[in-house]
Every structure is written in structure tokens, then in C-alpha cells.
Amino acid sequence: QPCPYPMAPPNGHVSPVQAKYILKDSFSIFCETGYELLQGHLPLKSFTAVCQKDGSWDRPMPACSIVDCGPPDDLPSGRVEYITGPGVTTYKAVIQYSCEETFYTMKVNDGKYVCEADGFWTSSKGEKSLPVCEPVCGLSARTTGGRIYGGQKAKPGDFPWQVLILGGTTAAGALLYDNWVLTAAHAVYEQKHDASALDIRMGTLKRLSPHYTQAWSEAVFIHEGYTHDAGFDNDIALIKLNNKVVINSNITPICLPRKEAESFMRTDDIGTASGWGLTQRGFLARNLMYVDIPIVDHQKCTAAYEKPPYPRGSVTANMLCAGLESGGKDSCRGDAGGALVFLDSETERWFVGGIVSWGSMNCGEAGQYGVYTKVINYIPWIENIISDF
């Protein structure tokens, strides 16, 4: 006996079309673009039913259901807006992702996604992955362009990248992105195999304040060219945090230098160092201090450190020097690992040019200078570590 005439589901069609369907005859269902074959909620690759000898089809009719991309996934540090209509997530619907203003900016694409026939939200570039809200770097409340000696008190938001590192000794670092800290290798060398021993604090001005954002280290990466207790060449390290920190006006990453950054770091250009290191009174600072200091001619600095007790070649091409010939303004013990920052007048963002590394025994001494790791020499190293881990 013939099987019942197959009625195509809405937005679908039957093939082949026959006057009647008898034993072993079959039909398939094909859906229009933007509609998918569904049995329940599960997608079917194809659908073919066969007429059985009892005059019934061997499979129930599927549905041709409009493709529904479903509620879009949450975007960390961002939000999503339904453009087509409130909660509309079906074929050709449009949504717009955006990042939390001021502190995050969108990477990868423009944030506009369309629900495509394959059931996935897809960007105009064809990407099915979420955009990325990347922290904006180099924002500071300051409008003017580890070791702070002869400095001034910092105000909230002046140095939001400043990180206090406790673990054996007091040191500093600078926040990169939202889960990395840039610091000096010598400051964290002892903890390289025990990263969890590092107590990392940010978002505070007062060294002893109980009000701070706590972060913990997942791993410490010391530059492979750094040799402990044998000079300070390659005195640079990265700390990976075990969680992303929330960016706000008091916690903001510092920018890495662009290729053009050296034009803002010539001799006599002013950089700013900040930290809780020893002050003129000989104690660690309670309040975050900062000092504006000029870059010193490299040859001049090399010469200053060629006299005993400094071994020849103490100052290398991987270092830069800053300070006043007359002394009085310097970084000092406790400031190690902090950032020497410069204002990029083109982007109006602050970037890290140096890392507080070493200097004369007597901070702020005339004719001696603070020596900083030259960050621009290590951009490939930094980028490789961050992309690999």
C-alpha cells in the first residue's frame, strides 16, 4: 500500500516529487538557506525517509527551522547590543559587541556580528571567535611629560601601572596588558622557581595600605642572558599573573615602546621614575614617590661607571642612564623593577622606556646616574614570552 503523501515542512521542500510513494520509494527534505534540518534541537546533515511495507514512513518528518545562533557569548570587559531587535538571534540578525569605555579597546574586528546560515555569529571578516577587549595602556592622571630619591608624592591615577612586589625584599614592577608584570630580573631572581611566593599589589599609593588589589604570580620568566651576581646586563623579567586584573583609573597597564619611541628618549629628554624605594631620609617611602629625570648621554654614563669600584663594561648597550649631573634626583633601593616612563606626544600615551636596575651605592650622588634596562632592546623577547604563555 502507498505511504501518505509527504507534506514538506514550512521553509523546506520534498524531492523527488511523485504522484504516489510505494514500498521502497523514498523522499528527501531540503531546507531554504538560513533554515536547517532539525530533529528536536539537533542538526541533521540530511534527511531521507523510506516507504515501508506497512504503508508508513520509516522516520518522522523533521522541521526546517530558522537558523538560531543563540544568545551571543559574553565578552569579557565588554557588552553586546542586539541591533536587529531585542533578543533576536536568528538568521541574518545583527549584534554589536563593544568594550567598556575608557579602559578597554576592541581588537580583532569592529565588533559587528551577523547570524549566518551555519548557526554561528560571524564578523564582517568571517571570524567566528569573539572580539577581544584589550586594556588601554599608558593612561595617566598626570598631564606633564628599583630607586626614588629627591622626588615628589604621587597622586591617585598618576602611575596606575605601578606594581609593588613583596617577596624577600621590596621591589616594583609595571603592569603590561592585564595579566603580566614587567620588572627587573635581579628583583625576582630568588623567586624564579617559587613564583607563588611573590606578593603582588597594585592600585594603591600607600606601601603599607590594606586597601590594594592583590595579584599572585603564576610564573616568572627571567631573561636567559641575565647572570645573577655578575653585572646587570639583560636585567629584565616578566611575571605572569594567575588572573587578569580589572582595569580602572587606578590600575592601568603601561604601553610598550613603539618603534618610533627612541625619538622621545634622546639625551636630555625627561623620563619619570616612580616607586616606594629609599628616600633622602634613608627609609622606604610610605607614599608612592616619583621623580622627573633627564636621560644622560650613554658615553658619559659609561665613563662615570668605569672608575673603581665598578668593573669595566658595567654599562652596556642594553642599558640607559638617567639623572642629574649635580645629583639629588634618582631612584634607589626598593625601586628596582619599576618603570622609567616617557610620554609619547603623538599617541598621548605613556610608555616604559627603562626598568630601574642599578646605580651608585649612594643614591642621587653627583656625577653618578641611575642605570635602567633599555626596554626597546627587549620588545621581541617580551612579545615572544607573552604570545607563548
Partner: antibody, heavy 118, light 106 residues
Framework: QVTLKESGPVLVKPTETLTLTCTVS??????????VSWIRQPPGKALEWLAH???????SYRTSLKSRLTISKDTSKNQVVLTMTNMDPVDTATYYC??????????WGQGTLVTVSS | QPVLTQPPSLSVSPGQTASITCSGE??????AYWYQQKPGQSPVLVMY???QRPSGIPERFSGSNSGNTATLTISGTQAMDEADYYC?????????FGGGTKLTVL
């Protein structure tokens, strides 16, 4: 971002009932064609699908375990619960909850190891 | 429930192509899905609906499915691809997994 986290006892006695909870975030249990699946993996063995539940409350179970399994969801708590009665040592496994999307199981929890022993 | 059969193990040298097969009756009529599982970790979806790569999965992973066999191909295999791989399909609203293939990168 999308996360799923399993919770429940790590040790169950034979004949007891196992109750596992999957807490989800980053997606909705009430809208779209999203589902949550439970899958288990005995030590050193292959993955075994157990059950799933969709936003519409459509449920499905592994045929051989159908009489022992119950899956449900609490949308307000963003939770999916699996109960498995009459536990046996052969049910010792890591139990995963995972999201179903476009037929694929695209996000998995970290899994919870359940040992059945007296 | 229908059975999906995978070879228990497969060894390839770095840079070579690995082809992991999954066979089942009329599997080509259904969508095949593939998962990668590294020791001590949860599985990761590496291929959906036969040949679609989820975001974040390298282009060296590709898939095909016809007749009775679905294949996951890894071209230019890397050491990091060493893992167990499982195929999966849906049959009448129930999921079926293959027995898994242990891929060793020599």
C-alpha cells in the same frame, strides 16, 4: 566567557545515588538551541555520553542507563543536575558536563572524579 | 546504540600527515564531530559538522565524512598534537563516541 563547573561527591558507596551539579556561566540555559550534556570517562577508557537537556527542556538519555538517570535544569541558578541511582564500582569515572551548540560539544567543564567504593 | 570504530593508535613523525578514521554504518549521512584530549585535561572540540573548525583550532586540522567513514586529518603534525582523539555522532538524539585513537608524534 563560557564556563561550566561540575560539583558533587568524590566518593560514593555502592547502591547509593549520585547527584552531580553543573553550574554554567557565559550563556543562557533558557534561550536558543543550547544544551548541556553529561559525559563520563572511566580511568584509561573512552568517553561515554550519558544524557542531555536543551533550553526547551527536551531530554535524552543513554539507552543502557535510561532507568538510572535523571537530568534537570534550574534556569534561575544556571544549573543542570544529573542524578544516577544504584551506583556500582564500574561507574567510577571522571564526569564532565559540557555545552552543546550546533550539535558539537564545544565547551567542557574540568571534570570531577567520582569513585564508587565501599 | 550504533558503534563508531577508531584505530586504537597511530604514530606519525613531526611534519607528516596524520589521518584518523572513524567508521560506522551510514556515518556519512550524519554529522561527525571530533575531540582532542590531552592527558589530565578535558576534551576540546576540534571539528564540528564534518569539516568545520571552531575558532582557535589551527588550519592544519581538517575533516571529511562520506560513506561509512569520517576522517580527521592533521597536516604537518606537531608535537603538541599528541593526544587522544575521539569521533562522535548523533543517532536519534543520543550521542555516540568512538573508542578513541591515541596519536603519538615520534
Amino acid at each position: 566567557q563560557v564556563t561550566l563547573k561540575e560539583s558533587g561527591p568524590v566518593l560514593v558507596k555502592p547502591t547509593e545515588t549520585l547527584t552531580l551539579t553543573c553550574t554554567v556561566s557565559g550563556f543562557s540555559l533558557s534561550r536558543g538551541k543550547m544544551g548541556v550534556s553529561w559525559i563520563r570517562q572511566p580511568p584509561g577508557k573512552a568517553l561515554e555520553w550519558l544524557a542531555h537537556i536543551f533550553s526547551s527542556d527536551e531530554k535524552s538519555y543513554r539507552t543502557s542507563l535510561k532507568s538510572r538517570l535523571t537530568i534537570s535544569k534550574d534556569t534561575s541558578k544556571n544549573q543542570v543536575v544529573l542524578t544516577m541511582t544504584n551506583m556500582d564500582p564500574v561507574d567510577t569515572a571522571t564526569y564532565y558536563c559540557a555545552r552543546i551548540r550546533a550539535g558539537g560539544i564545544d565547551y567542557w567543564g574540568q571534570g570531577t572524579l567520582v569513585t564508587v567504593s565501599s | 546504540q550504533p558503534v563508531l570504530t577508531q584505530p586504537p593508535s597511530l604514530s606519525v613523525s613531526p611534519g607528516q600527515t596524520a589521518s584518523i578514521t572513524c567508521s560506522g554504518e551510514k556515518l556519512g549521512d550524519k554529522y561527525a564531530y571530533w575531540y582532542q584530549q590531552k592527558p589530565g585535561q578535558s576534551p576540546v572540540l576540534v571539528m564540528y559538522q564534518d569539516k568545520q573548525r571552531p575558532s582557535g583550532i589551527p588550519e592544519r586540522f581538517s575533516g571529511s565524512n562520506s560513506g561509512n567513514t569520517a576522517t580527521l586529518t592533521i597536516s604537518g603534525t606537531q608535537a603538541m598534537d599528541e593526544a587522544d582523539y575521539y569521533c562522535q555522532a548523533w543517532d536519534s538524539s543520543t550521542a555516540v563516541f568512538g573508542g578513541g585513537t591515541k596519536l603519538t608524534v615520534l
